[in-house]
């Protein structure tokens, strides 16, 4: 992770290589312009930080201390002036083309292998979630440490979050919450969910009231995932920051120990960004430390945090892990998920403003059917004859991808994969299978959401003692 000490030059070089590989992966997978530009902006900023620290341009495949011939290769200074989108643009389009094994190597995380999955099964006495079995959550940092603690009856807690940028949530947004709910159930641990309404106010054209109201609306969808009210605290930053001195003290501690150069490198900030943006990463980091929640953990600082998140969030928590020992706290552990594909496949961005880019939690059964049939990118052949002869491609077929996320029955999924790949199952039949999974899933979610009253939301969002037994 980039920081101001000279020893970090190689780390900064490696961060650029990592980000470069991510950019290449996104480009090779035909990700959306917003997503690519966001990643490129971060990369350009990292390169500028490298030049400032090293006194020379970053050179691909030429680490610091390995002098390279003088070069004017690469984009001129004006390259940085091309239009980019901020890193906080929601990045949830398809990961087609991304080699996750390579990302693990580049990011320096660890693969969630069979051994770790078996260990989770032994520790919990529960069958591993299909997100684990199917490699949807595929990478981790320090999960073995969490299991060590758990097996020794030592506590840990879960932390996840949501940037409430609009009232419309789609099925992709449910992935971390579905998995976090499972983790909460099997480990029987407390959970904090951060609603970063302050972040959205800083980045989007919203009033404070709008940002907060989105947080409350989104909280209803999150609550509908079935979280235990006695073990879950959902908080709005705008609300909680002003009432929790423990939380704010940690924010300030983090702010003191992270340089502008570091956040510039990670988040792609420029001199024209408002100071609210620059200090925001500290607010996202603070829930990783248990004494940010004195009503739950009192003043304890030794309780480890486990954060389930998408792999593109990892740089943010690398900063958190970097700062933790410097302020006397344990590093949070991480579980990384793959990206969730847009209906149209890798070439388009899944966005709350495009109703056809995904299945929204507000969609009717008819809308779901129409969207899947009309817009879900198909890996099928051009003609029935060709499809019967050569079979379909499950690797690019969005309906099949969605089934890997939402069809829990492994045997059924494998049968569908075999039938579609062999040509026995046609695209229309595959889409029908997905519709039959999604319609009840969304209908049930909507029914549960209807039952979430303002009083229930208020209780989830009230700082309070949670019921669990920590030694």
């Amino acid at each position: 992770m980039p920081n101001s000490e000279p020893a970090s030059l190689l780390e900064l070089f490696n961060s650029i290589a990592t980000q470069g590989e991510l950019v290449r992966s996104l480009k090779a997978g035909n990700a959306s312009k917003d997503e690519i530009d966001s990643a490129v902006k971060m990369l350009v900023s990292l390169k500028m930080s490298y030049k400032a620290a090293a006194g020379e341009d970053y050179k691909a495949d030429c680490p610091p201390g390995n002098p390279a011939p003088t070069s004017n290769h690469g984009p001129d200074a004006t390259e940085a002036e091309e239009d980019f989108v901020d890193p906080w643009t929601v990045q949830t389009s398809s990961a087609k083309g991304i080699d996750y094994d390579k990302l693990i190597v580049r990011f320096g995380s660890s693969k969630i292998d069979k051994e770790l999955i078996n260990r989770i099964e032994r520790a919990t006495g529960q069958r591993p979630h299909h997100f684990l079995r199917r490699g949807i959550f595929f990478s981790h940092r320090d999960m073995n440490q969490v299991l060590d603690a758990y097996e020794n009856k030592k506590p840990f807690y879960l932390y996840t979050g949501r940037g409430p940028s609009s009232e419309a949530m789609h099925v992709g947004h449910l992935i971390p919450f579905i998995f976090t709910k499972w983790l909460q159930d099997v480990f029987n641990v407390p959970l904090v969910i951060q609603m970063t309404d302050d972040e959205k106010y800083l980045w989007k054209d919203l009033t404070l009231d709008q940002a907060y109201s989105y947080a409350v609306e989104n909280a209803k969808d999150i609550i509908a995932c079935g979280f235990d009210i006695n073990k879950t605290f959902i908080f709005s930053d705008l609300d909680y920051m002003g009432m929790s001195s423990g939380f704010y003290k940690n924010v300030v501690k983090i702010q003191k120990h992270v340089t502008f150069n570091q956040v510039k490198g990670i988040f792609g900030f420029t001199d024209s960004d408002c100071i609210g943006k620059i200090s925001f990463p500290a607010i996202q980091a603070a829930p990783s430390f248990s004494n940010s929640f004195p009503q739950i953990f009192r003043d304890r600082t030794d309780i480890q945090c486990l954060i389930p998140c998408a792999i593109d969030q990892d740089p943010y928590f690398r900063m958190t892990r970097d700062v933790a020992p410097r302020i006397g706290y344990p590093k949070p552990a991480l579980l990384h998920s793959t990206f969730f594909p847009a209906l149209q496949g890798a070439q388009t961005k899944m966005s709350a403003s495009d109703p056809n880019s995904s299945i929204f939690l507000t969609d009717t059964a008819k809308q779901i059917k129409t969207k899947v049939n009309k817009h879900a990118f198909s890996g099928g052949r051009d003609t029935i004859e060709e499809h019967r002869q050569f079979g379909g491609n499950c690797d690019v077929d969005v309906s099949f991808m969605y089934l890997t996320f939402f069809l829990e029955d492994d045997d059924k999924l494998e049968q569908i994969r075999k039938d579609y790949t062999s040509g026995a199952m046609l695209t229309g039949e595959l889409k029908k299978a997905l519709i039959e999974v999604l319609q009840p899933l969304i209908a049930e979610h909507q029914a549960r959401r209807k039952e979430v009253t303002d009083e229930i939301v208020k209780e989830f969002m009230t700082p309070r003692k949670l019921s669990f037994d920590f030694q």
């Epitope: 470069g20 590989e21 290449r24 480009k27 035909n30 390279a68 011939p69 290769h73 390259e79 091309e82």
Partner: antibody
């Protein structure tokens, strides 16, 4: 599906001009650096020119500097190569290629099928 | 004459392992990534290896790339008849501010 389709090739006399186009589809053209690469009959590949995604960085091979101009129109998803003062040694199949590297490194993951340019009197 | 030097030809029998070398200098291979392209007869080139040793999705693991100093090599194991093609290495050259290719190696499967 990613597609690159070159056009504009043909027979031209030495000293003449041609403008090649490369129509891109199936991806967000404005996010990618692009290059022209040529191949003379029976010979190897020769890189000709590259342009960054926004058009602000441009590079040429020494053999075409001052004669060829690369440009792009992101609103039309099209890459161009304006070739002036053509010589017999410019005779080749011209390919446009998409660069997926993040720094114009020549990571050409998709190529067009090529358009033949013949310079002869 | 090409900036990057490749043997003009190579050959092997089915199942064999063949290696194609690519030699450059400190201004190209020495300080930049190497890429390998396969060109089957009558078709456009295809990316085979990127960033020295990485395979794009869809490229069989029989193909592997490596780089050491100012040289790079492409290895093809378990040679098949469909591997018969021209193979090109490529890298950015800092001195020239240009992308350079090797002259190409014609691989024959005997």
């Amino acid at each position: 599906e990613v597609q690159l389709l070159e056009s504009g090739g043909g027979l031209v006399q030495p000293g003449g001009s041609l403008r090649l186009s490369c129509a891109a589809s199936g991806f967000t053209f404005s996010s990618y650096d692009m290059s022209w690469v040529r191949q003379a009959p029976g010979k190897g590949l020769e890189w000709v020119s590259a342009i960054s995604s926004g058009g602000s960085s441009i590079y040429y091979a020494d053999s075409v500097k001052g004669r060829f101009t690369i440009s792009r129109d992101n609103s039309k998803n099209t890459l161009y190569l304006q070739m002036n003062s053509l010589r017999a040694e410019d005779t080749a199949v011209y390919y446009c290629a998409r660069d997926v590297a993040w720094d114009m490194l020549g990571d050409f993951d998709y190529w067009g099928q090529g358009t033949l340019v013949t310079v002869s009197s | 004459q090409s900036v990057l030097t490749q043997p003009p030809s190579a050959s092997g029998t089915p199942g064999q392992r063949v290696t194609i070398s690519c030699t450059g200098s400190s201004s190209n291979i020495g300080s930049n990534y190497v890429y390998w392209y396969q060109q089957l007869p009558g078709t456009a080139p295809k990316l085979l290896i990127y960033a020295n040793s990485h395979r794009p999705s869809g490229v069989p693991d029989r193909f592997s790339g490596s780089k050491s100093g100012t040289s790079a090599s492409l290895a093809i194991s378990g040679l098949r008849s469909e591997d018969e093609a021209d193979y090109y290495c490529g890298a950015w050259d800092d001195s020239l501010s240009a992308y350079v290719f090797g002259g190409g190696t014609k691989l024959t499967v005997l």
